[in-house]
């Protein structure tokens, strides 16, 4: 062609896929008259015309730019819509008259990759591997022209390097033309890598400058042999019986050894193996004093059979032993004295406390209770209390009964009953004494007696109200060696008009149910008459 | 063309070890990772041992003790054994090719039968 | 170890249909996810990877989706040689597969 030595460089015109370039032809008036006007492109040293100009008027040629050309800028700028990879070429202009002149212009197309696919080794990496082992993929789709992979680790580019670190990278042809870059990081890791962030990144370009893409970060599983291993026990601190207790191998190798707990037989000094659970970890529950001794853990490598062992780790269970109260069954006459004597081994320091059983209230503080010139009211439960301090929840405790001799002594000396006449009434009737009194009623019912401790009875029964009943009362009776004591029951028959009792009574304790004797499925709430101050 | 074929005796008696062959042309074993998949009768598919480009192994842990998988990379060949055969190992193996840049197996053997039985 | 859920096991459709086979993971895989179809007698073909990206050759009517824990492979034509079973396949700790859906004919 006629001067093309001189020709300048080409213009450069950057546009992204999809998108329109506009072609604009840079002929100055004297190089051509732009209303007659060929368009060509050229690829691989071959121009093929795809574009004329007459008198203003664009026409396409046949082929692969037919539809997607047309004139714009009264002719000057070609618009090519729909741009594609394979559009990257040089397209020309050239002016017809007054002579032959043409215009360059060098098309360059672009196309950000996908975002970057990042694909760690899913079986994990050996540290004592003999060369680089795959660490991860990653993937660009869809790029214009080929990306740059730069893949790091902790924020730090990673570099090539010789037996270390290898970066291979391939691209693909799409049949769009656009580019698909897959790239794998091989490296030798160490045991630090474990916690090690790698990532991939993709630089590319587009008209408006140069852009990257960053993967998700990824940790790769790292393997390395066990160095260490030792014991943890769960709950920290001072173990007491009764706790949930779990003794536990561990290691610092990935994956871990298979795990063997062993505890010292205290007479033979031999280690023997205790029986884990699936997870290999020792459960005691609950825990006895007996499992206080000495522990190990031993991790066995299943590929190199190495066995390593761990320091020994001494268990204390905390407890405190049966408590112990002398004298075990104490009786005592009126006025006299009892000193109550505690006593309990521990694995720590003890602390006692006696209370009153039936109040709670707590009547010394130590091992020794005295009690002076006792009183009948003095007999009943006394409760004496081992604990350790330093231990919450870790005490025992011992009851002990104290039995005052003397006759029976009622509940109650009187007690008025509101009744209904055929109603089956439920009376009851409580004493106490020592020797432990028996219970008899003056009428004829279904009577039942049940001890309530070793000084106390009580007595239930179920009887009809009749005519008589009514005019007579109940009476209970309470005997024992060294005497005997009666309780009143009057029964007053519940007037229906009567909303609220006297005010001078007051709720009893016990209730009277209706039996097939009545006609009607009815309660009756006993009543009972103010205590009087001596129940003797 | 990538090609991976399966060998192995076809029937095994309980408690003997089971040696199987995959013989592999179209790649090298030294860029591709090779593994061993087993199917039952009627089953669906179990990985069960590869080895890496780089020759690293690596096992299902359910079957770890009583595996080895080895190769030989100037005949080509992946081997595995597995020792303790029971019935429950009757199965279709196969050998598969890991893709070079993914993890995932872009090309398998036809596989070979092996029965476990007296 | 990651479990993988395919639901249904078996399904029945006519030439022509639109097919979803699902893929559930017991924990996030992220995109670490093939699927592959099987035919009686045959190996195990690989048609999805990375979770969505079509395998060389592969007609475009199978394409995959999903993410984290669940996953999707769709037929958007059912063709007479697509009837077999396919299976998913997590990739990203250790390898499993599902256990299976069978395509039949209706």
């Known amino acids: 062609v006629p001067g093309e030595a001189e020709q300048p460089a080409p213009e450069l015109v950057e546009v992204e896929v999809g998108s329109t370039a506009l072609l604009k032809c840079g002929l100055s008036q004297s190089q051509g008259n732009l209303s007659h006007v060929d368009w060509f492109s050229v690829h691989k040293e071959k121009r093929t015309l795809i574009f004329r100009v007459r008198q203003g008027q664009g026409q396409s040629e046949p082929g692969e730019y037919e539809q997607r050309l047309s004139l714009q800028d009264r002719g000057a700028t070609l618009a090519l819509t729909q741009v594609t990879p394979q559009d990257e070429r040089i397209f020309l202009c050239q002016g017809k008259r007054p002579r032959s002149q043409e215009y360059r212009i060098q098309l360059r197309v672009y196309k950000a990759p996908e975002e970057p696919n990042i694909q760690v080794n899913p079986l994990g990496i050996p540290v004592n591997s003999k060369e680089p082992e795959e660490v991860a993929t990653c993937v660009g789709r869809n790029g214009y022209p080929i990306p740059q992979v730069i893949w790091y680790k902790n924020g730090r580019p990673l570099k090539e390097e010789k037996n270390r670190v290898h970066i291979q990278s391939s691209q693909t042809v799409e049949s769009s033309g656009l580019y698909t870059l897959q790239s794998i990081l091989k490296a030798q890791l160490v045991k630090e890598d474990k916690d090690a962030q790698f990532y991939c990144e993709l630089n590319y370009r587009l008209p408006s400058g140069n852009h990257m893409k960053e993967s998700r970060e990824v940790t790769v599983p790292v393997f390395y042999p066990t160095e260490k291993v030792w014991l943890e026990v769960e709950p920290v601190g001072m173990l007491k019986e009764g706790d949930r207790v779990e003794i536990r191998c561990l290691a610092d190798g990935n994956p871990p050894p298979h795990f063997s707990i062993s505890k010292q037989n205290p007479s033979t000094r031999e280690a023997e193996e205790e029986t884990t659970n699936d997870n290999g970890v020792l459960v005691l529950e609950p825990a006895r004093k007996e499992h206080s001794g000495r522990y190990e853990c031993q991790g066995l490598d299943l590929d190199t059979m190495i066995s390593l062992l761990s320091e020994p780790q001494e268990l204390l269970v905390n407890y405190v032993s049966d408590v112990r109260v002398s004298p075990a069954a104490p009786e005592r006459q009126e006025g006299s004295s009892l000193t109550l004597t505690c006593e309990a081994e521990s694995s720590q320091d003890l602390e006692f406390q006696w209370l009153r059983e039936e109040t709670g209230q707590v009547l010394e503080r130590g091992p020794v209770l005295q009690l002076h010139d006792l009183k009948r009211e003095a007999g009943g439960g006394y409760r004496c209390v081992a604990s350790v301090p330093s231990i919450p929840g870790l005490n025992r405790t011992q009851l002990v009964n104290v039995a005052i001799f003397g006759p029976p002594w009622m509940a109650f000396k009187e007690r008025k009953v509101w009744v209904k006449e055929n109603m089956v009434l439920n009376l009851s009737c409580e004493a106490s004494g020592h020797p432990r009194p028996t219970i008899s009623w003056n009428v004829n019912g279904t009577a039942s007696e049940q001890d309530q401790d070793p000084q106390r009875v009580l007595s239930t029964l179920n009887v009809l109200v009749t005519p008589e009943l009514l005019e007579t009362g109940v009476e209970c009776t309470a005997s024992n060696d060294l005497g005997k004591n009666t309780s009143i029951l009057f029964l007053e028959l519940v007037n229906l008009t009567t909303l609220t009792p006297d005010s001078n009574t007051t709720t009893g304790l016990s209730t009277s149910t209706a039996s097939p004797h009545t006609r009607a499925n009815s309660t009756s709430t006993e009543r009972k008459l103010p205590e009087p101050e001596s129940r003797g | 063309e990538v090609q991976l074929k399966e060998s192995g005796p076809g029937l095994v008696q309980p408690s003997q070890t089971l040696s199987l062959t995959c013989t592999v042309s179209g790649f090298s074993l030294t860029s591709n990772g090779v593994s061993w998949v087993r199917q039952p009768p009627g089953k669906g598919l179990e990985w069960i041992a590869a080895i890496s480009s780089g020759g690293t192994t690596y096992y299902n842990s359910a079957f770890k003790s009583r595996l080895s998988i080895s190769r030989n990379t100037s005949k080509s060949q992946v081997l595995l054994k597995m020792n303790s055969l029971q019935t429950e190992d009757t199965a279709m193996y196969f050998c598969a090719r890991r893709y070079g840049y993914g993890w995932y197996f872009d090309f398998w053997g036809p596989g070979t039968m092996v029965t476990v039985s007296s | 170890d990651i479990q993988m859920t395919q639901s249904p096991s078996s399904l029945s459709a006519s030439v022509g249909d639109r097919v979803t086979i699902n893929c559930k993971a017991s924990?996030?895989?992220?995109?670490?996810l093939a699927w592959y179809q099987q035919k009686p007698g045959k190996a195990p073909k690989v048609l999805i990877f990375?979770?969505?990206s079509l395998q060389t050759g592969i007609p475009s009517r199978f394409s995959g989706s999903g993410s984290g824990t669940d996953f999707t492979l769709t037929i958007s034509s059912l063709q007479p040689e697509d009837f077999a079973t396919y299976y998913c396949?997590?990739?990203?700790?250790?390898?499993?597969f599902g256990q299976g859906t069978k395509l039949e004919i209706k």
């Open positions: 396949q997590q990739f990203y700790s250790g390898y499993t």
């Open positions: 990375n979770a969505n």
């Open positions: 924990q996030n895989i992220y995109n670490s």
